[in-house]
């Protein structure tokens, strides 16, 4: 029951996380204009991974896509790649995890197969979450670097009458969405991996034979224990002696993965 709950919760948390990663990737507010130096601006700028936007006080918003590929900074391209990889891995992970859910019956799928699928999806979620966190962190680092560079530039060349206020950008809402979503996907992945351990079947898959000491000699018939491994014939083994040894098949006819000594 706990395993099913852990797996189900892991799936839901990952689903929310991946939805968040997709949302963050599509959002326009990765960086927003810093209003500290110019709080009275009537024009507000913000930028995303795919386009930059300008919102005027009047309500008019204009967005322009980055139609160039080669002209974009390498860091921006890297962030795009990380986010897309995160989304793709997450989507595949979700698909795999749906079939791995213990509460869903698909044909005669073994528990071992479900365990493997749960582990696979868990790893995918972890990598997906890490990709998103890495992407957002790289972008945040880029913003911080540019912020201080533009701050340094802002206070140079102010000797003249005319001032040119350089637009500085700070963290946008998408960064926080991305960090949270990446974290959730990561947590969901870890939960799936934990659930996988509970789903894994016992590896001790053997038949036990017990021996009882006897006072008189026993004649053993060659091949008498041929089917005692539990993987051969389903017919009951005949008792070929009066004392000494007997097969566990007399107690349990069919092979089982829960046979203990």
């Amino acid at each position: 029951m706990a395993v099913t709950a852990c797996q189900g919760l892991g799936f839901v948390v990952s689903l929310i996380g991946i939805a968040g990663i997709i949302a963050a990737t599509c959002m326009d507010q990765w960086s927003t204009q810093d209003l500290y130096n110019n709080p009275v601006t009537a024009v507000f700028n913000y930028q995303g991974l795919w386009r930059s936007c300008v919102r005027e006080s009047s309500g008019f918003t204009e967005c322009r896509g980055y139609f160039t590929l080669l002209g974009l900074p390498a860091m921006l391209q890297a962030v795009r790649a990380l986010m897309i990889v995160g989304i793709v891995l997450g989507a595949i992970g979700l698909l795999v995890s749906i079939f791995a859910l213990k509460c869903i019956r698909i044909g005669s799928m073994e528990d071992s197969a479900k365990a493997n699928m749960t582990l696979t999806s868990g790893i995918m979620f972890i990598v997906s979450g890490l990709c998103a966190i890495a992407g957002v962190s790289v972008f945040a680092n880029m913003l911080v670097t540019n912020f201080w560079m533009s701050t340094a530039n802002m206070y140079t060349g102010m000797g003249g009458m005319v001032q040119t206020v350089q637009t500085r950008y700070t963290f946008g809402a998408a960064l926080f969405v991305g960090w949270v979503a990446g974290g959730l996907t990561l947590i969901g992945g870890v939960m799936m991996c934990i659930a996988c351990r509970g789903l894994a079947p016992e590896e001790t898959n053997y038949k036990a034979v017990s021996y009882h000491a006897s006072g008189h000699s026993v004649a053993y018939k060659p091949g008498g224990f041929k089917a005692s491994t539990g993987f051969g014939s389903n017919t009951k083994n005949k008792k070929i002696y009066d004392g000494g040894a007997r097969t566990e098949d007399e107690v349990q006819s069919y092979p089982s993965k829960h046979d203990y000594v």
């Epitope: 110019n38 601006t41 005027e56 006080s57 009047s58 008019f60 001032q163």
Partner: antibody, heavy 118, light 112 residues
């Protein structure tokens, strides 16, 4: 058809308050901003403040302590209140619709003349 | 506050001539995000309220004759009226609409 009409008291005593109402038609106050601009006799234009569609306001820094702008969307009315009037507040007061583009002001009322005198 | 300086304060021309008037701002009105200049031009004829001519420094308002042309970027802007007509007799104001307060220039009076 876009129309803006200002209605004011005409004559106000010094240190008193000025209240002007701007009644609009042909557009919604929830979508467009309304600016207030004044023009002293024979002088240039002075922007006083604006109330945007979402209700947010911005005022001229020199008047921020004396000026307040509000509106009633359902009645399509915008209100200007200027406190502690002095003689140099004598002017024609215009209410002006904000354009959707470029923060410009595209439709002007005819203006209401206000004289501050004892 | 951004200070808008217009020159000349008045100019006299004959009908059919081309006239240019200048507007300078104390800070750049160019927005880096969309490369647009947030400057507007208004025309105020005697006894009338002002009328919007140009926004974004160079975009003509609908219904404005194409003899009115706005140009310039950053801090220096120009309004050009080609083939001036008698009806163009007015005071022309430039206005900063980039940051609050939305300051006006002192105006250029066109006499014909």
């Amino acid at each position: 058809q876009v129309q803006l009409k200002e209605s004011g008291p005409g004559l106000v005593a010094p240190s008193q308050s000025l209240s002007i109402t701007c009644t609009v038609s042909g557009f919604s106050l929830t979508t467009y901003g309304i600016n207030w601009v004044r023009q002293p006799p024979g002088k240039g234009l002075e922007w006083l403040g604006v109330i945007w569609g979402d209700g947010s306001t911005n005022y001229h820094s020199a008047l921020i302590s004396r000026l307040s702008i509000s509106k009633d969307n359902s009645k399509s009315q915008v209100f200007l209140k200027l406190n502690s009037l002095q003689t140099d507040d004598t002017a024609t007061y215009y209410c002006v619709k904000s354009s959707y583009y470029g923060n410009a002001m595209d439709y002007w009322g005819q203006g209401t003349s206000v004289t501050v005198s004892s | 506050d951004i200070v808008m300086t217009q020159s000349p304060s008045s100019l006299t021309v004959t009908a059919g001539e081309t006239v240019t008037m200048s507007c300078k701002s104390s800070q750049s009105l160019l927005n880096s995000g969309n490369q647009k200049n947030y400057l507007t031009w208004y025309q105020q004829k005697p006894g009338q309220p002002p009328k919007l001519l140009i926004y974004w420094a160079s975009t003509r308002e609908s219904g404005v004759p194409d003899r009115f042309t706005g140009s310039g970027s950053g801090t220096d802007f120009t309004l050009t009226i080609s083939s001036v007509q008698a009806e163009d007799l007015a005071v022309y104001y430039c206005q900063n609409v980039y940051s609050y307060p939305f300051t006006f220039g002192s105006g250029t009076k066109l006499e014909i």
